[in-house]
Interface confidence: low
């Protein structure tokens, strides 16, 4: 019978403030009241499915209660009012939603820009979340036209694209209006020559042009966006090498006009260079274009601008007034080499004699020398032309090396080994560090490096390993032949070690027993051994610690209980910790040597 | 994501009260739209509510357990307890915590539970 | 009060199987019922809230439907993992809230 509801609220669909107060009335119709026999008494009223206290209502008269909420904090609450029929079941009469939220703020931060090709767009900061559908519409004039309003999108809502086609040199006024169902507010306008907001396309088709003539320049072109012809451009360039993460940037005051292409000087012969470029409005007002699309070229080959490092090996078991000498020398680097290495050239001469000239593709040449004094010089060409060459002396069979370099120390930093050495008095003219791995199961393969005169601290370039032993070798080399070199052992990481020792008696009596040990062959040590340690206890007693200093390969236990079985076993340390070794037991004897019960 | 966390004693004596604290972490408690809810479940039976409570201290409880149940908030420290006074065997359950989404009408999310034993 | 009551109180079925739970009111709550699932030792989950809406992470294969006081849980093809009691609950007149005595899904 009761199709339509039994009543209603007041108001029906409300909005308001957030910690606000607010008062709904229900009202009931005369025929449900005649029908379930109620009246405004029978009413509940009951949020998000919760009954309010009754100290919350107001009767107003026999057909209309009220409730009143006070500082409301919920953006959504269901309200509904009920009555109580017969047999206290429960009817709805009515709901309503009431929705809270904030009014608007005023917006703030208009900007707007005109993007080369496309219609003008302005973005601002919406301000606070209101929690409510909130409208925001930007209106723009000339002093003369109104324009159409562009109505921010809902997904969008602080940015809107103008549909008008943009005109400069013609100042425009834009504002925007925020609005919702508890207010409406207006932005400070802003007034412009949207000439002065235009983003450019960036410039196109770069390519990057060599030069044969100049190794160390390339010459850019590109096309210019159409709007060159509304605007003056300004450039920045920039450019790296092919394997590099960072840019470097022309100097911009050398790109502040409109212009179509621009040489790049003081680069690296045959290096590839990546270049690309933007623009804007030459007085900085405006925005940056986007990059160019990056393009790339390589500069033309120069001749090698550095000698390689070049050294020699004699091998020891040399022939009756003949020695067999390996000349080696080093790759340059691709900055060093300025183009592709074609060859190498080695000439000899016998002191004060004929030249032997020799041409080498690979990084050594082995030649059989008499015992004089030779010089030896190493050049490396190109497709451009030769280095300078590197000379070496190498003296005679009966040449005594001196003046080695004094104070050498090795330590490993920031994950590699340094070499540090005080130079000698007399002039060097480059140092040679040889370095290789000590091992008891393989030769000792030597890497080398060299360095100039003037050097005293440096570190080794080469793929090294933790917890290997190297021995490491300066050599100074003067103008009449190498110095004495000097080695030293460092670790580019200590470990402890990978086995103990293993100890073992070498006599025993009634009271003391005497143990030794081997050193640790150098393949387990993992660092340098700083100290042992010997325990050693009976099955009953606690345990003795005693501390053995490296160098030393026995100890004699002292003040031991006669038969008794001790049991033993020692540790070696290195700076990282250390590893101990098997445990090993032997028995004190009842009575000392010619001693009777 | 929001968690609730119950803690208390897992043993309470006859004619004592049994006191639990719920902690929400991932989410305020003062969160507009959402009450926070107790439940129990006595072994081998069925889910019983015992209370409500919105973050603001507004509390409902179940008529039938109403002069026992005390359900109170510690804002500062995200947290939600409750206390049944005169507790009997008959209140040995696993309560849980859980939180009423409002707008649904329902416990979306809910603590894993806490054994009670009231046992002397 | 409004009494929920549910039925079958325990039921057996194989996986793949088509299930169906009702769960009555003792007066009309209009569209206020949720259903929860609750597996041994473990706390009850949220399956259906406002008779037939699915919460968020639930699988499509379980549905709500019914209004006033008759209302149903479907599983529309049973997985393992969903051999577990079943709760429906209403939320129209409250306090106080009211669970019915629960459905146990078991492996036939």
């Known amino acids: 019978e009761l199709l339509d509801p039994c009543g209603y609220i007041s108001p029906e669909s409300p909005v308001v403030q957030l910690h606000s107060n607010f008062t709904a009335v229900c009202v009931l119709k005369e025929k449900c009241m005649d029908y379930f026999h109620v009246n405004a008494n029978y009413i509940v009223w009951k949020t998000n499915h919760f009954t309010i206290p009754k100290e919350q209502y107001t009767i107003i008269n026999r057909t209309a209660s009220s409730v009143t909420f006070t500082d409301i904090a919920s953006l959504n609450i269901q309200l509904t009012c009920n009555i109580l029929t017969f047999g206290q079941l429960e009817q709805n009469v009515y709901g309503i939603t009431i929705i809270s939220g904030l009014p608007p703020e005023k917006p703030k931060n208009l900007s707007c820009i005109v993007n080369e090709g496309k219609k003008m767009r302005c973005e601002w900061d919406g301000g606070r979340e209101t929690h409510l559908e909130t409208n925001f519409t930007l209106k723009s004039e000339w002093a003369t036209h109104k324009f159409a309003d562009c109505k921010a999108k809902r997904d969008t809502p602080t940015s809107c694209t103008v549909d008008y086609s943009t005109v400069y040199f013609v100042n425009i006024e834009v504002w925007v209006e925020a609005e919702n169902a508890l207010g409406k507010v207006t932005s400070d306008h802003i007034n412009f020559d949207p000439v002065y907001k235009v983003k450019p396309n960036p410039p196109h088709n770069l390519s990057v042009i060599n030069s044969e003539e100049l190794s160390s320049i390339l010459k850019l072109t590109w096309t210019n966006p159409s709007i060159k012809s509304v605007i003056i451009l300004k450039y920045n360039i920039q450019y790296r090498t092919k394997d590099a993460s960072t840019w470097s940037q022309i100097p911009p005051e050398d790109t502040a006009s409109t212009r179509s292409s621009f040489t790049v000087q003081d680069l690296k012969p045959f290096t590839e260079y990546v270049f690309r470029i933007r623009c804007m409005k030459e007085d900085g007002k405006g925005y940056w274009s986007d990059w160019s699309e990056e393009a790339s070229g390589i500069t033309y080959e120069d001749r090698p601008s550095k000698a390689p490092s070049f050294w020699y090996k004699i091998d020891p078991s040399h022939t009756q007034g003949y020695r067999t000498v390996q000349l080696v020398w080093k790759t340059l680097p691709p900055f060093e080499a300025n183009g592709k290495i074609l060859d190498y050239e080695v000439t000899l001469t016998r002191w004060k004699s004929h030249l032997q000239n020799y041409t080498v593709n690979a990084t050594k040449l082995t030649v059989n020398l008499t015992n004089d004094r030779y010089l030896a010089t190493l050049t490396v060409r190109n497709l451009v032309g030769k280095s300078d060459a590197a000379v070496l002396t190498i003296p005679a069979c009966d040449f005594q090396a001196t003046h080695p370099v004094m104070d050498l120390k090795a330590f490993p930093k920031d994950n590699m080994l340094w070499v540090e050495w005080t130079t000698p008095r007399e002039s060097v003219k480059k140092y040679i560090l040889e370095w290789c791995v000590l091992s008891d199961k393989a030769p000792c393969i030597t890497d080398w490096q060299q360095e100039d005169g003037t050097v005293h601290r440096t570190y080794l370039r080469g793929n090294l390993a933790e917890s290997k032993c190297y021995l490491i070798t300066v050599t100074p080399v003067y103008a009449d032949g190498p110095g004495s070199p000097e080695s030293i052992k460092a670790y580019l990481k200590q470990a402890p070690p990978s086995k103990g020792p293993t100890v073992r008696t070498k006599k025993v009596g009634k009271n003391e027993a005497v143990l030794e040990w081997d050193q640790l062959p150098v393949d387990v040590q993992n660092g340098f051994i700083r100290n042992y340690t010997i325990f050693y206890r009976t099955i009953i007693g606690n345990e003795t610690a005693v501390n053995v200093d490296s160098s030393h390969t026995e100890y004699t236990l002292s003040s031991l209980t006669s038969d008794t079985l001790y049991m033993v076993r020692m540790a070696a340390y290195t700076d990282e910790g250390g590893k101990d070794g098997p445990e090993f037991t032997f028995t004190t004897p009842k009575f000392a040597q010619g001693e009777i019960e | 994501q929001l968690q609730l966390q119950e803690s208390g004693p897992g043993l309470v004596k006859p004619s004592e009260t049994l006191s639990l604290i719920c902690t929400v972490s991932g989410g305020s408690i003062s969160s507009n739209n959402y009450y926070w809810g107790w439940i129990r479940q006595p072994p081998g039976k069925g889910l019983e509510w015992i209370g409500n409570?919105?973050?603001?201290?507004?509390?409902y409880y179940n008529p039938s357990l109403k002069s026992r149940v005390t359900i109170s908030v510690d804002t500062s420290k995200n947290q939600f307890s409750l206390k049944l006074s005169f507790v009997t065997a008959a209140d040995t359950a696993v309560y849980h915590c859980?939180?009423?989404?409002?707008?649904?009408?329902?416990?979306?999310?809910w603590g894993q539970g806490t054994m009670v034993t009231v046992s002397s | 009060d409004i009494q929920m009551t549910q039925s079958p109180s325990s039921l057996s079925a194989s996986v793949g199987d088509r299930v169906t739970i009702t769960c009555r009111a003792s007066q009309s709550i209009s569209s206020y019922l949720n259903w929860y699932q609750q597996k041994p030792g473990k706390a009850p989950k949220l399956l259906i809230y406002?008779?037939?809406s699915l919460q968020s992470g639930v699988p499509s294969r379980f549905s709500g439907s019914g209004s006033g006081t008759d209302f149903t849980l479907t599983i529309s093809s049973l997985q393992p993992e969903d051999f577990a009691t079943y709760y429906c609950q209403q939320s129209y007149s409250t306090p106080p809230i009211t669970f019915g005595q629960g459905t146990r899904l078991e492996i036939k």
């Open positions: 409570l919105y973050g603001s201290g507004s509390t």
């Open positions: 406002a008779a037939s």
């Open positions: 859980a939180r009423w989404d409002t707008n649904g009408g329902a416990f979306d999310i």
